[in-house]
């Protein structure tokens, strides 16, 4: 049994890091493999992650972490029984994938304005809380070409757009994702999408 693609990990910079790797053949990850991880820190304890299958030869493990900070560095050991298959390390702050924003809501009761709001996925005491920026994707269910991205570079998790920038009388969907420049993160996953019917009064023409 050998590792074909070494584990690569990303951290949500809060409580979970996800590591993925591929074996050289079909593997029952949860029964045959264990990923041991330990913070390189005084008094730290070793933890064991039981991987799950991710395709025939792929495995994925969700590592639980407390109080993640930029100085943290973890040792990783991948075991198959008594055999050490791979040894590496992982610094969560250098491989951050933020959590996806939640609770995306479209408020259509403001005159001729659409207000989109969502929730910041981090608590106020997490460093990323004040450093996320967002991308909002709005698209038409009827017209695949009607697809747009709004970059939200301010901290408030909201976006106002004129309803008239979208077509009236049809349904739209929106979703939002986040990233943080400070840690050069990747984009988060998209939030679940929300749907609304866009309607507004056309301006009266003489």
């Amino acid at each position: 049994m050998k590792v074909l693609q070494e584990p690569t990990c990303v951290s949500d910079y809060m409580s979970i890091s996800t590591c993925e790797w591929k074996m050289n053949g079909p593997t029952n990850c949860s029964t045959e493999l264990r990923l041991l991880y330990q913070l390189v820190f005084l008094l730290s304890e070793a933890h064991t992650c039981i991987p799950e299958n991710n395709g025939g030869a792929g495995c994925v493990c969700h590592l639980l972490m407390d109080d993640v900070v930029s100085a943290d560095n973890y040792t990783l050991d991948l075991w198959a029984g008594q055999q050490l298959l791979w040894k590496g390390s992982f610094k969560p702050s250098e491989h951050v994938k933020p959590r996806a924003p939640g609770n995306l809501t479209v408020h259509t009761n403001v005159s001729d304005t659409l207000l989109l709001t969502w929730s910041n996925p981090y608590p106020p005491d997490n460093y990323l809380y004040n450093h996320l920026t967002y991308a909002v994707n709005i698209w038409s269910e009827n017209d695949p070409a009607d697809f747009r991205i709004y970059n939200v570079t301010y901290l408030e998790p909201s976006l106002r757009i004129a309803a008239s920038t979208l077509k009236s009388g049809i349904s739209y969907r929106a979703r939002v994702r986040a990233w943080a420049q400070c840690y050069n993160t990747t984009w988060s996953e998209w939030s679940p999408s929300t749907k609304w019917h866009n309607s507004y009064r056309e301006p009266f023409e003489q």
Partner: antibody, heavy 116, light 111 residues
Amino acid sequence: QVQLVQSGAEVKKPGASVKVSCKASGYAFTSYYMHWARQAPGQGLEWMGIINPSGGSASYAQKFQGRVTMTRDTSTSTVYMELSSLRSEDTAVYYCARGKYWMYDWGKGTLVTVSS
Amino acid sequence: QSVLTQPPSVSAAPGQKVTISCSGGSSNIGNSYVSWYQQLPGTAPKLLIYDNNKRPSGIPDRFSGSKSGTSATLAITGLQTGDEADYYCGTWDSSTVWEWPFGTGTKLTVL
């Protein structure tokens, strides 16, 4: 919000021991290390040691080795710092502080006076 | 005695800028991150800066930190009378046994 509530002031005689408590609330107690530091009157801060509330293991500054013991009670989310063989120069305010590489939150401090 | 050296005192007028230095060595500041703590008279220390230059939520951006080599600096702009306090740098040293030294402390007086 995070709160670290420390026990009240103590007056001790030289040679005696003192045990200071620090009750934590507002966060997952076993997820954060706890430091202890002290400050003698008019002096600076001095680090004493650190405890991992998850497993209960502790490590102490070399200066205090053999005289200090840090423990925890997960059922009450409380950490303790016991200092023995007290001498007059141990008169200080003792602080618990939550954190790993740095101290996010501090208790208000416990004044320990050592006097004959 | 502390292995991190700070000036005993600094002073400046309201609205001015002041800097406080913290000098260490290769086994502590040179190999770790620096934090800064503010201690108002009669109160417990409070975290002001961590990770060399990050501010906890609620700390105004008048406070900033930087690190270069084995030294670190705390800068305070737009000084206010309420900033009058003792300031301590801190770091950790894992070269032999792990220890968390604090700086000698600096008394800031707002004139």
